[in-house]
Interface confidence: medium
């Protein structure tokens, strides 16, 4: 008879800029109506109101208008809260408090995360290097959360721990930029790798630089961008890195910098006549004005959308000119799949059931894999459909038709091919006759 309020034991991990669902369910008694329900979501520590339902209606968000309930599911005991455009400041514990005649509450932890960008590597000095020279290699990775772990190694995979200085600085959004500096004496040639690990996402971002000491030609404007695509999560900010080599005596009055879409040559952002001319791209771009004089022409693209995906050209002219194109690969993680069974009652071995695995709001299109409890792939009788919404994010629905054995586990894995992120759900069907979901 008691009112049981249930939340996940494990923290909900949410990527900055994405939406998170804080699951909470209660057990309504027969005859329960929403008019009886008081539902409060609040911050556990401060008791600050986040969202509420009372007097038979949703009383709305008290938390920056970024929360929503699932009104159609409340009557079935689903008191889950959707938190939109997650920020670092949202991290913490949220209490779901339900009162009808009885009351109950439970707290769910939100762990916020943001993947670190592929590190950029800079060398100082970066010209006229000879064996025996001491160089400073800087590995910079941006906009991650929580703080990163940084590892250096040489070309043979041997860890480099001496002469490493790592600093991490949080920006206004609470995201960390990590800068790790390795001081090393050059050999005849050498490869130096930097790995930036996000401890929550278990995501590794790495880059390496190979130094072959020799004289390099001078005079030309060398414009450098990352070879690999920049991967940015929908809703987050991305930095399209571009650098050039200013000559001695260079001043910003001499600089023409143009960022444009490679294919259409549509202007994105520009710097000329000694000043930033601003964004021509939906007011979502910015340069790093304090760094331009040192040859940093990188572009910041805010609140990334699926439509931003593509190639951007960084064009620099001083006296000479040069350009390079950098690819932006947009991504969004797929939600943990929800599993449904049809039919879902009185199941017996030999029955044919349809198991649907649904995962939402990912990009690009997912790869879906099914397997049984022994890890054996299930490829027959699988139909997968993917539909893009207005923002270009995909909802994936994969349907497996299977004949039940005495019991069995069926797992669905939804893979984001860009993020190499796997989201999986499984359903175990046992006993006879049986019902899904299992009744409490």
């Amino acid at each position: 008879g008691a009112l049981e309020v249930q939340v996940p034991e494990d923290p909900v991990v949410a990527l900055v800029g994405t939406d998170a669902t804080l699951c909470c369910s209660f057990s309504p008694e027969p005859g329960f109506s929403l008019a009886q329900l008081n539902l409060i979501w609040q911050l556990t520590d401060t008791k600050q109101l986040v969202h509420s339902f009372a007097e038979g209606q949703d009383q709305g968000s008290a938390y920056a208008n970024r929360t929503a309930l699932f009104p159609d599911l409340l009557a079935q005991g689903n008191a889950s809260l959707r938190l939109q455009r997650v920020r670092v400041a949202d991290e913490g514990s949220f209490t779901c408090f339900v009162s009808i005649r009885d009351f109950g509450s439970a707290a769910v932890s939100l762990q916020v995360a943001a993947p670190y960008s592929k590190p950029s590597m800079t060398l100082e000095p970066n010209k006229d290097l000879r064996p025996g020279d001491t160089v400073t290699i800087t590995c910079s990775s941006y906009q991650g959360y929580p703080e990163a772990e940084v590892f250096w190694q040489d070309g043979q995979g041997v860890p480099l721990t001496g002469n490493v200085t790592t600093s991490q600085m949080a920006n206004e959004q609470g995201l960390f930029d990590v800068h790790s500096i390795l001081r090393v004496v050059l050999g005849a040639n050498g490869t130096y790798s930097c790995l930036v690990r996000n401890p929550v996402l278990q995501q590794d971002a790495h880059s390496s630089v190979t130094i072959t000491p020799q004289r390099s030609p001078t005079g030309a404007v060398e414009v450098q961008v990352p070879e690999d695509p920049v991967v940015a999560l929908v809703g987050t900010d991305a930095t399209l890195r571009c650098s050039f080599s200013p000559e001695p005596g260079f001043s910003l009055a001499q600089l023409n910098l143009i960022w444009q879409l490679t294919d259409t040559k549509q202007l994105v952002h520009s710097f000329t006549e000694g000043r930033d001319q601003g964004s021509a791209y939906a007011n979502r771009t910015a340069l790093f004005p304090d760094l331009l004089a040192q040859g940093n022409a990188s572009l910041r693209l805010q609140r990334v959308r699926v439509a931003d995906e593509g190639s951007f050209t960084c064009f620099v002219s001083i006296r000479d000119f040069g350009s390079a194109a950098v690819s932006l690969q947009v991504a969004a993680p797929y939600s943990k799949p929800s599993m449904t069974l049809e039919p879902n009652k009185d199941l017996r071995p030999g029955d044919t059931v349809t198991i649907t695995c649904s995962s939402y709001r990912g990009y690009p299109e997912a790869e879906v894999f099914w397997q049984d409890g022994q890890g054996v792939p299930l490829t027959g009788n699988v139909t997968t459909s993917q539909m893009a919404n207005e923002q270009g994010l995909f909802d994936v629905h994969s349907v497996l038709r299977v004949v039940l054995g005495a019991n069995g586990t069926y797992s669905c894995l939804v893979r984001n091919p860009v993020l190499q992120q796997d989201a999986h759900g499984s359903v175990t069907i046992t006993g006879q006759p049986m019902t899904f979901p299992p009744e409490a």
């Epitope: 008879g1 008691a2 009112l3 049981e4 309020v5 009886q36 008081n38 409060i40 609040q42 008791k47 109101l49 509420s52 009372a54 007097e55 009383q59 209490t95 408090f97 009162s99 009808i100 005649r101 009885d102 009351f103 109950g104 509450s105």
Partner: antibody, heavy 119, light 108 residues
Amino acid sequence: EVQLVESGGGLVQPGGSLRLSCAASGFTFSSYAMSWVRQAPGKGLELVAAINSNGGSTYYADSVKGRFTISRDNAKNTLYLQMSSLRAEDTAVYYCTRNEEFRRGLAYWGQGTLVTVSS
Amino acid sequence: DIQMTQSPSSLSASVGDRVTITCRASENIYSNLAWYQQKPGKAPKLLIYAASNLQSGVPSRFSGSGSGTDYTLTISSLQPEDFATYYCQHFWGTPPWTFGQGTKLEIK
């Protein structure tokens, strides 16, 4: 008929402990949340603790947090309030109440039991 | 926690008078409010629940109104047995659900 009967009150020295009981009858005790409300002499009402029907959720007023523990034994139809580290300001009549559907207030109260904390 | 402020703290009135007691919450409590009457040496008695609903057995001269943060208890025509202390209590959010400080209604 719903009945709530408190017991266990009395005189206790500062720093001492006391356990109040509330025997419930006339309704299905295990289906209702319960609360303890106190009233110091000549003062207003203060809800000091509440517990849900299976004892899984408990709440306390800041003034008693860490010192008082509310609990229940549904098999015995009894509600308890364990009070320790008692202070003079805990002197009050303690009422046991039954929580209705929350919008419906506290419809049923016991007669109260007096706790006096004094040296 | 939500604070409940009741006014006035005391009130003198005569039999037959119309009396109004107000209760203000420190934040929106969405009509989750009850009113109680307490006589000396007795336990409180529930009069009104959900801001405006009359508890069974309570005379119809008692009524409640309000929404958001401001609520009112009205006694349309005072009877001798109505002289007592009145309390409001909210039931919004997590416990403890606090009471107002009380209004003592005395005979003029």
